[in-house]
Interface confidence: low
């Protein structure tokens, strides 16, 4: 053995943000010839010894952190990075606005504001086409998302979600889309 078994990848298809009652597939991908996979939901006793978990209709109880590993011979791989499976549409959608407005000159500043009438303490902003929340690496934000020195790359469609830190995998429906235009 020349090194530890590399960790597999775990992905959610089509997305890790899943509207309630919609389908999602979790797929664990290791090297060819794997003897056995283990796909599990953390902080629960739920696991399966298969590489693919098909969820035909997303439920609140299925939201949470998942990870997988695989076995070759008697050896187990390092675990995959955790995948956070989020149920969306649990709460009413927030509103997303741009200050001073959705049309901004290149080099200017704009602030996207996500507002909700509920007492949520967490907000996430997504740009269409980007896999991660806006302003990675810090994952969650308050209601204001400042974009300093706007460039053409910031153009696009944005949506935000609100949720509570008490239930971090149960999110609101997405806001109506906001089109940011950089001139």
């Amino acid at each position: 053995q020349s090194g530890p078994l590399p960790k597999p990848s775990l992905q959610a298809l089509p997305s890790s943000l899943v509207p309630l009652e919609k389908p999602v597939t979790l797929r664990c991908q290791g090297p060819p010839g794997v003897d056995l996979y283990r796909l599990e939901k953390l902080s629960s006793s739920r696991y399966q010894d298969q590489a693919v978990l098909f969820i035909p209709a997303m439920k609140r109880s299925l939201a949470g952190r998942y990870r997988c590993s695989y076995q070759n011979g008697s050896l187990w791989s390092l675990p995959s990075d955790q995948l956070e499976l989020v149920a969306t549409g649990v709460f009413a959608k927030p509103s997303l606005s741009a200050q001073p407005g959705p049309a901004v000159s290149s080099g200017g500043d704009v602030t996207l504001q996500c507002q909700t009438r509920y007492g949520f303490d967490q907000f996430a902003l997504y740009k269409e086409g980007d896999p991660a929340p806006y302003k990675n690496p810090e994952r969650w934000y308050r209601a204001s998302f400042p974009i300093i020195t706007v460039t053409a790359a910031h153009s696009g469609t944005y949506r935000c979600y609100s949720f509570s830190s008490r239930d971090p995998y149960l999110w609101s429906a997405p806001s109506d889309p906001l089109e940011l235009v950089v001139t």
């Epitope: 696991y47 990075d81 990675n136 690496p137």
Partner: antibody, heavy 114, light 106 residues
Framework: EVQLLESGPGLVAPSGSLSITCTVS????????VNWVRQPPGKGLEWLGM???????DYQSTLKSRLSISKDNSKSQVFLKMNSLRTDDTARYYC????????WGLGTSVTVSS | DIQMTQSPSSLSASVGGRVTITCKAS??????IAWYQHKPGKGPSLLIH???TLQPGVPSRFSGSGSGRDYSFSISNLQPEDIATYYC????????FGGGTKLEIK
Amino acid sequence: EVQLLESGPGLVAPSGSLSITCTVSGFSLTGYGVNWVRQPPGKGLEWLGMIWGDGSTDYQSTLKSRLSISKDNSKSQVFLKMNSLRTDDTARYYCARDLPMDYWGLGTSVTVSS
Amino acid sequence: DIQMTQSPSSLSASVGGRVTITCKASQDINKYIAWYQHKPGKGPSLLIHYTSTLQPGVPSRFSGSGSGRDYSFSISNLQPEDIATYYCLQYANLLTFGGGTKLEIK
């Protein structure tokens, strides 16, 4: 070759803040997480928190309000920031790769004292 | 948070002998336990992950077993270079170290 190297201030005043940098080589921060662990003098190892490849973070619950972990993927650097320091934060601080922690730095010693 | 109770806190054994260290988790950790060797002036070294999988280059004198909440780590044919402090680590939900076991040679 995988390597992690911690660098810190050495001495910090009580109620001050601590900033430590972990510079990594031999792997990409987009594909691996990095943990922070400390060891007070004469005591055991204590996990502080972790930043994942995608940038999300986990923290030990008792330290969550005082800790912040961030990174700069392009510079292969991970940053630990801790505020409201107390004398019992005196420890050797280590960074270590991913889950479980398969590679470690040698650590940097931090003393909290006036 | 998951707690890990490691015992004993110290032990002494003879060269060629065998020692066993145990860790008990406060809840089922589904075999997500690792064992580390820590020598003064160095960073800890990962010996075993996922209960029993040895890291490359780690001698087969080291072994691990267990399930549920109860886990053990053993060193057989003890060597002078095994003098160190050993820690268990659960990584089922966040991470928690055991308190450590300081191993001395008689």
